[in-house]
Interface confidence: low
């Protein structure tokens, strides 16, 4: 807001008064104001803003005041050459008050010549009858931005869904730089992935690491000189490996004697990715098995030829256990009965053209 | 059981460019972190830098400028070329692999092979 | 960078004694710490990682604990062939750092 006094009594502890009446410029200044007709004191339509030097491009200071008889700058408490000024004025159709504007331009090698702790600055000082008021400080900055960031973001390598901080400090500057977060050479919007968070103090926050997060970091600082970039921090999210679940024993890879059966599992669940660990353990369980061997059936030798029976045939047989088979093994091929004709015995054969029936003895 | 092999000149003149290859056996060189880490007589361990598989590196800053980490995932191989050495770069270099986890700890080891700057 | 510095840089001790070798990061790394044995003229030997988890095939005499900034490597009863250097080396950020190592001899 405006601050008003009246007659040079001071707001400011900016030693005021400080241009001293040899000064030729404040010899234009009134020495006495008219009471008569009475009139409010100056009041600032606009106000001079601070002000930044770009390279060697000089600023304007610019303010308006209403009523004014004069307007003047001051700068570091030193009144500004009545020349230096660039004033226009008008009365106001409506209140019928004086509207003065004044504008004055400041180079760089004006702010660079000042000498002291305190930054250059300027301010209004407004006359009406009433008395003075004088503007808010301006304040009138030669910007610059470092080339060096003063924290650097690192890379880093992170498993999923992780919370990733990197930091950057950016460069020292005038005015400060305002701070950007690249993925790679696109801006990061945290408004519209809600991932990412940018901190006060310009660090970057991926709050649940996701595979698509592996990507060059950059931070952008940037003021009205320039814009600088950090070095690119590589962030790896990576997946370290599971296993999946076992599959069903094998068949016992012996058909006959002492084997093993297998079972095996892969590291795909997930497999590791982007330099996650490998799983730990076994891929294969092996584990003794043993299988009966099969045996096939052999025939035992002939019996003897039974007697000769009634029916004029006598027989013989084998067994299939020698051995019998076991353990799946082949059955024995072949009869185990066989008979034939036979004539002698109890053998009962018909006479020829005859009833009877002779009977051989053996 | 993952074995790492450096080899290259034992003697580099200064300001030469120092060249070592590590040759990787026993297991694939994708999805781990591969180091260079050296040790001058008597001292302790530097990182050096490492490469990924997908060919992210990293470098110390400290020798970042003079410093190339380069892989052939072809040939199981990863190398390291160190450009203007001076006396101060007279060490045994180790390859080394970075386990992927967080902490990336360096499980697997070369036996490392000493390398003297001298004329 | 982040300087990981060991203490003490070396100690004496007799069979079954029990060891402990602390490690401070200059910042906060977590838990993103491992440990390493080197006997004289062969590589680093991965001991534990994770600053806590014990490598397969390491013996269980050997344990790691902490978590930020302080970290301690504990030997519960010193073996022979537990004469070495040991070496802590953090993964929180690049570059990688090891600490200066601790150089356990025989009393």
């Known amino acids: 807001g405006s601050h008003h006094h009246h007659h040079h009594g001071s707001d400011y502890k900016d030693d005021d008064d400080k241009g001293s009446q040899d000064d030729e410029f404040f010899h234009e200044l009134p020495e006495t104001f008219p009471s008569d007709p009475p009139e409010p004191l100056p009041h600032f339509l606009i106000e001079p803003e601070e002000a930044y030097i770009v390279k060697n491009k000089p600023v304007n200071l610019y303010c308006k005041a209403s009523p004014a008889t004069q307007i003047y700058f001051k700068c570091n408490s030193e009144w500004v050459h009545q020349k230096d000024h660039v004033v226009d004025e008008r009365v106001d159709e409506t209140s019928g008050l004086i509207v003065r504007e004044v504008s004055i331009e400041i180079s760089r090698q004006q702010v660079e010549e000042l000498f002291g702790p305190e930054d250059y600055w300027c301010q209004c000082v407004a006359w009406s009858s009433a008395g003075t008021t004088k503007s808010r400080k301006a304040y009138v900055r030669i910007a610059y931005l470092r080339k060096t960031f003063e924290q650097e973001p690192l890379g880093k390598e992170v498993s999923l869904e992780q919370e990733v901080l990197l930091q950057c400090r950016p460069p020292e500057g005038i005015p400060v730089a305002e701070v950007e977060w690249l993925k790679n050479e696109d801006i990061i919007d945290p408004a519209e992935d809600r991932n990412f968070y940018i901190t006060i103090d310009h660090n970057l926050i991926i709050k649940q690491a996701r595979l698509s997060d592996t990507a060059n970091y950059t931070c952008v600082a940037k003021n009205i000189v320039a814009k600088r970039k950090s070095t690119t921090a590589t962030v790896i999210v990576y997946v370290n490996g599971g296993w999946s679940t076992w599959t069903e024993w094998s068949v016992c890879n012996s058909r006959c004697g002492r084997g093993y059966q297998k079972r095996t599992r892969t590291c795909t669940n997930p497999a590791p990715l982007n330099g996650g660990a490998f799983c730990e353990g076994q891929s294969v369980q092996k584990i003794a098995c043993t299988t009966l061997c099969p045996v096939d059936g052999r025939w035992t030798s002939w019996s003897k030829w039974s007697t000769c029976g009634t029916e004029c045939t006598h027989w013989r047989r084998r067994e299939c256990t020698a051995p019998a088979p076991k353990n799946g093994g082949k059955d024995c091929d072949g009869l185990v009965l066989q008979s034939k004709n036979c004539t002698d015995g109890l053998c009962m054969q018909a006479a020829p053209d005859s009833d009877d029936v002779a009977l051989y003895g053996s | 059981q993952v074995q790492l092999q450096e080899s290259g000149p034992g003697l580099v003149k200064p300001s030469e460019t120092l060249s070592l290859t590590c040759t990787v056996s026993?297991?694939?060189?994708?999805?781990?972190?591969w180091s260079w880490i050296r040790q001058p007589p008597g001292k302790g361990l530097e990182w050096i830098g490492y490469?990924?598989?997908?060919?992210?590196?990293n470098y110390n800053p400290s020798l970042k400028s003079r410093v190339t980490i380069s892989i052939d995932t072809s040939k199981n191989q990863f190398s390291l070329k160190l450009s203007s050495v001076t006396a101060a770069d007279t060490a045994v270099y180790y390859c080394?692999?970075?386990?992927?986890?967080?902490?990336?700890?360096?499980?697997?080891w070369g036996q490392g092979t000493l390398v003297t700057v001298s004329s | 960078d982040i300087q990981m510095t060991q203490s003490p840089s070396s100690l004496s001790a007799s069979v079954g004694d029990r060891v402990t070798i602390t490690c401070r990061a200059s910042q906060s790394i977590s838990s993103y710490l491992n440990w390493y044995q080197q006997k004289p003229g062969k590589a680093p030997k991965l001991l534990i990682y994770a600053a806590s988890s014990l490598q397969s095939g390491v013996p269980s005499r050997f344990s790691g604990s902490g978590s930020g900034t302080d970290f301690t490597l504990t030997i519960s009863s010193l073996q022979p062939e537990d004469f070495a250097t040991y070496y802590c080396?953090?993964?929180?950020?690049?570059?990688?750092?090891f600490g200066g190592g601790t150089k356990v001899e025989i009393k």
């Open positions: 080394a692999r970075g386990r992927g986890m967080a902490t990336l700890p360096f499980d697997y």
């Open positions: 490469i990924h598989n997908s060919g992210t590196t």
């Open positions: 026993g297991g694939s060189i994708s999805s781990y972190f």
């Open positions: 080396q953090q993964s929180y950020s690049t570059p990688l750092t």
